[in-house]
């Protein structure tokens, strides 16, 4: 029975140019994590493996970052970023566990007049 | 089986510089980060900063950032800590240790720095 | 920068006793929180991680709980093996920080 539960940071939003920080955090389950993948629709982004440490893919290497801790964080962002993230964390005895991020990355100046206009 | 090796000690004078080694084997080096601790005393551990030797990004504790450089080797899986400026201050145990998917899940054995005239 | 606390600085207590060793967070670290065991003129040892993950090889006595801000390293019926310095660690962000320790001594 799975029993584990995944808290992500949500729906969250960077400026163009920028960097971000994504996590998730597995909580609730004695499983083993064998190994935390992190993907973006369909692309693999970057695995931590126990045993093996980390692979960023090729594609992503001058722009993804691993950490801090099991997190990844992502550089230089452009609107092409904006979209679906996802951890998938694998643990034994239990199986896969996925964790969901929207990305929307805004431009310079959406990004600041929407920051202002939240300051209460 | 993994490893990281650390020179016992390090003996330096007030105003020198010294550059501490920690030597990795039984892992592939360029896939985990490298951390450093520094150990006054047998007190509090302080964590001073890290590299990743994959591609070289570091991260530094603000209160560090004027007296480490971290560098590594990847022909020898050697990573670097260059301390300047020293003062007794810097005197202490300095460990390297490796994280990846169970954080700091192996340690050096330390290397002791003593400052002194 | 994410401060941890521990308490109490010191544990004096008996071998078959039971204690539980606190670590508090100024803000929440969800469970990126590792407890590490150091004995005098050695590296420390990695117990439990991710707040509650056993490292393979450490004895079943140990147990981490906690989410947050407030995590507790518990041991069962104390072996003399076990005396020694208890440190908590963060790294849900950098710079990563380390609690002051708990020192767990033989009463």
């Known amino acids: 029975m799975m029993t584990g539960t995944i808290e992500t940071t949500g729906n969250i939003s960077a400026e163009k140019g920028g960097s971000i920080i994504l996590q998730c955090h597995l909580s609730s389950t004695t499983a083993q994590v064998t190994q935390v993948n992190w993907e973006q629709q369909d692309q693999l982004l970057a695995i931590c493996n126990a045993d093996l440490g980390w692979h960023i893919s090729p594609s992503f290497k001058d722009r993804v970052a691993p950490g801090p801790g099991l997190g990844l964080t992502l550089q230089s962002l452009t609107v092409n970023d904006t979209g679906e993230y996802f951890c998938i964390y694998h643990t034994y005895p239990d199986g896969t566990y996925t964790g969901r991020i929207f990305l929307e990355v805004l431009e310079s100046s959406v990004a600041e007049h929407g920051a202002r206009f939240q300051i209460p | 089986q993994v490893q990281l090796q650390q020179p016992g000690s390090e003996l330096v004078r007030p105003g020198a510089s010294v550059k501490l080694s920690c030597k990795a084997s039984?892992?592939?080096?360029?896939?985990?980060?490298m951390h450093w601790v520094k150990q006054r005393h047998g007190q509090g551990l302080e964590w001073i900063g890290n590299?990743?030797?994959?591609?070289?990004?570091?991260n530094y504790d603000e209160k560090f950032k004027n007296k480490g450089t971290l560098t590594v080797d990847t022909s020898s899986s050697t990573a670097y800590m260059h301390l300047s400026s020293l003062t007794s201050e810097d005197s202490a145990v300095y460990y390297c240790?490796?994280?990846?998917?169970?954080?700091?899940?192996?340690w050096g054995q330390g290397t002791t720095l003593t400052v002194s005239s | 920068d994410i401060v941890l606390t521990q308490s109490p600085a010191t544990l004096s207590v008996t071998p078959g006793d039971s204690v539980s060793l606190s670590c508090r967070a100024s803000?929440?670290?969800?469970?990126?929180l590792h407890w590490f065991q150091q004995k005098s003129h050695e590296s420390p040892r990695l117990l439990i991680n991710?707040?509650?993950q056993s490292m393979s090889g450490i004895p079943s006595r140990f147990r981490g709980s906690g989410s947050g801000t407030d995590f507790t390293l518990s041991i069962n019926s104390l072996e003399t093996e076990d005396f020694g310095m208890y440190f908590c660690?963060?790294?849900?962000?950098?710079?990563?920080?380390f609690g002051g320790g708990t020192k767990l001594e033989i009463k």
């Open positions: 240790a490796r994280e990846g998917l169970y954080a700091f899940d192996y």
């Open positions: 039984g892992y592939t080096f360029t896939s985990y980060w």
């Open positions: 590299i990743f030797p994959g591609s070289g990004i570091t």
């Open positions: 803000q929440s670290i969800r469970n990126s």
């Open positions: 991710y707040a509650s």
């Open positions: 660690q963060q790294t849900n962000s950098w710079p990563y920080t």
